[in-house]
Interface confidence: low
């Protein structure tokens, strides 16, 4: 049976989803266990004018010992405000001074990355050293890159289309995902339904995916379901500023007592489906629909409490 | 819902202070670039000054007119920006409007009138 | 600084005409933003990034361009179109606006 309930953007103000990913537009990740260096490049694309950007490194220790040399190669397309964070990290940092403005004095070594294109810029770096992990990234607002944590079975880092970059790479797209939402044709009441649809990643591995809601309205006026799909190698903590009735696929647990899983559901793994079963717990209001790539946290923030849906 | 209200405009002589805030709601002010544009009677739209976010160290930036006589300035606890106008001069009159940066000037206030005049 | 120039300052036309405006840059630029104001009013964001529309902004109005030349176009004019756009730039310091170009009814 088809559910009528016609999917429309939510404005911010109604509803902003944010999250955190491994996945990319393009990347690689390589063992180089022997070189002296670890080489990182990252290739960032800024669609819309001046752009601020958190760059965070992060070693972890080895045999009780900082890891060797990083070199950070950073090609930008557009110009940006970094704001790195490297503490105690012997960095070297190739970038286009031109483009590239620190928030504050890096406190680093820096040399100038020559104007190459992409292949010639991996090239450049490979001279330098093994390259331990390439990603080409759009519009990032947010980068974690972890040192010493590459685990990728190539050898020699060449840059596919659509890779995981586990846990060597996070970032935080700066454009938040689509929300949508839409009126239950037929339902009474106003019980609204947040329906998360986590899509398959590149890598099937077991994944936790964080979700933090926060609505923002009093406790008692809300009468809420939140709705989790994803792959069946994902599961779920949930942590939520309300009591709300959880539905989801795999396990899940809540922030407040993590070590208790309760299983989840088969749930249905189209819309449309996923619409139904809104429809069968009553949800009178989508408040919000969201499909995102495999994520490792995800914000929800919606202010629409029941009944009061407003689409852009 | 984004606000922002602007407040502080008013008359003042060639050479005079003036200080102007803008009070926002309805978003994470402390993650937000600001910023201050005016436009003169008739003309068109000017950029004034910016100040950033926390995870930007508040950096602040100004146009060249304005550089060592108007100081833009913030308080995150209050969710209010300011702009203070030194030695201001006849062609600083102009309407000045409050505005977020998020890839565009997404928002902006409904602006304050600073007239310059003896 | 790069010179924002658009053009005509003034354009004269009916409603259900079509109005090109156009915003010529002293040197390349990545994106160009429009915004519209209208008498008494503070500006509104009305396309970002060369050709996207901002929230509410009809679907008569489109954006393009590269390099030094970027164009609003208005399919249509309806009677609340009439207003004066600005366009703006950020792809070098400082941030700079255009003149603006009134669109005034016939």
């Known amino acids: 049976e088809t559910v009528h309930c016609d999917l429309q953007p939510v404005g911010p103000e109604r509803g902003e989803v944010t999250y955190t990913t491994s996945q990319v537009s393009k990347g690689c990740v390589a063992q180089a266990p022997n070189a002296i260096l670890e080489v990182h490049v990252l290739f960032l694309e800024f669609p819309t004018g001046p752009s601020q950007l958190e760059l965070t490194l992060q070693a972890s220790k080895q045999n009780g010992t900082w890891p060797r040399e990083v070199l950070l190669v950073l090609s930008v397309n557009s110009s940006v405000f970094l704001h790195l964070q490297a503490l105690g990290i012997p960095l070297h940092l190739a970038y286009n001074s031109s483009l590239v403005t620190f928030q504050e004095p890096p406190g680093v070594n820096t040399t100038e990355l020559p104007s190459f294109p992409k292949t010639q810029i991996l090239e450049w770096a490979a001279e330098r050293g093994p390259i331990t992990s390439a990603a080409e990234l759009n519009d990032p607002q947010s980068i974690l890159l972890r040192l010493g944590q590459a685990q990728g079975s190539l050898s020699f880092c060449m840059l596919e289309a659509s890779q995981d970059m586990g846990r060597t790479l996070e970032w935080r797209p700066r454009t938040p995902a689509l929300v949508r939402g839409c009126h239950l044709e037929g339902v009474a009441g106003h019980k609204e339904a947040h329906i998360l649809r986590v899509l398959p990643g590149h890598s099937a591995g077991p994944r936790t995916v964080t979700v933090k809601v926060e609505l923002s309205c009093a406790p008692g006026d809300l009468d809420a379901v939140l709705i989790l799909q994803g792959p069946p190698y994902v599961s779920w903590l949930i942590d939520a500023n309300h009591n709300m009735q959880i539905w989801t696929t795999g396990e899940y647990s809540f922030k407040i007592f993590p070590e208790k899983n309760i299983r989840g559901f088969k749930l249905p793994d189209t819309p449309q489906g996923l619409l139904g079963e809104a429809r069968m717990l009553n949800a009178s209001i989508v408040a919000s629909f969201v499909e995102l790539p495999l994520a490792s946290i995800v914000s929800l923030h919606a202010s629409s409490c029941g009944g009061r849906l407003q689409t852009s | 819902e984004v606000q922002l209200v602007e407040s502080g405009g008013g008359l003042v002589q060639p050479g005079g202070s003036l200080k102007l805030s803008c009070a926002a709601s309805?978003?994470?002010?402390?993650?937000?670039?600001m910023d201050w544009v005016r436009q003169a009677s008739g003309k068109g739209l000017e950029w004034v000054a910016e100040i950033r976010s926390k995870a930007s160290n508040h950096a602040t930036y100004y146009a060249e007119s304005v550089k060592g006589r108007f100081t833009i300035s913030r308080d995150d606890s209050k969710n209010t920006v300011y702009l203070q106008m030194n030695s201001l001069k006849t062609e600083d009159t102009a309407v000045y409007y409050c505005t977020r940066w998020r890839r565009f000037f997404d928002s902006w206030g409904q602006g304050t009138l600073v007239t310059v005049s003896s | 600084e790069i010179v924002l120039t658009q053009s005509p300052a003034t354009l004269s036309l009916s409603p259900g005409e079509r109005a090109t405006l156009s915003c010529r840059a002293s040197?390349?630029?990545?994106?160009m933003h429009w915004y519209q104001q209208k008498p008494g009013q503070a500006p509104r964001p009305w396309i970002y990034?060369?050709?996207n529309l901002a929230s509410g902004v009809p679907a008569r109005f489109s954006g393009s361009g590269s390099g030094t030349d970027y164009t609003l176009t208005i399919s249509s004019l309806e009677p609340e179109d009439f207003a004066v756009y600005y366009c703006?730039?950020?792809?070098?310091?400082?941030?700079?606006f255009g003149g603006g170009t009134k669109v005034e009814i016939k």
């Open positions: 309805g978003f994470t002010f402390s993650d937000a670039w």
């Open positions: 040197s390349s630029v990545s994106y």
């Open positions: 990034a060369t050709s």
């Open positions: 703006q730039q950020w792809s070098s310091n400082p941030l700079t």
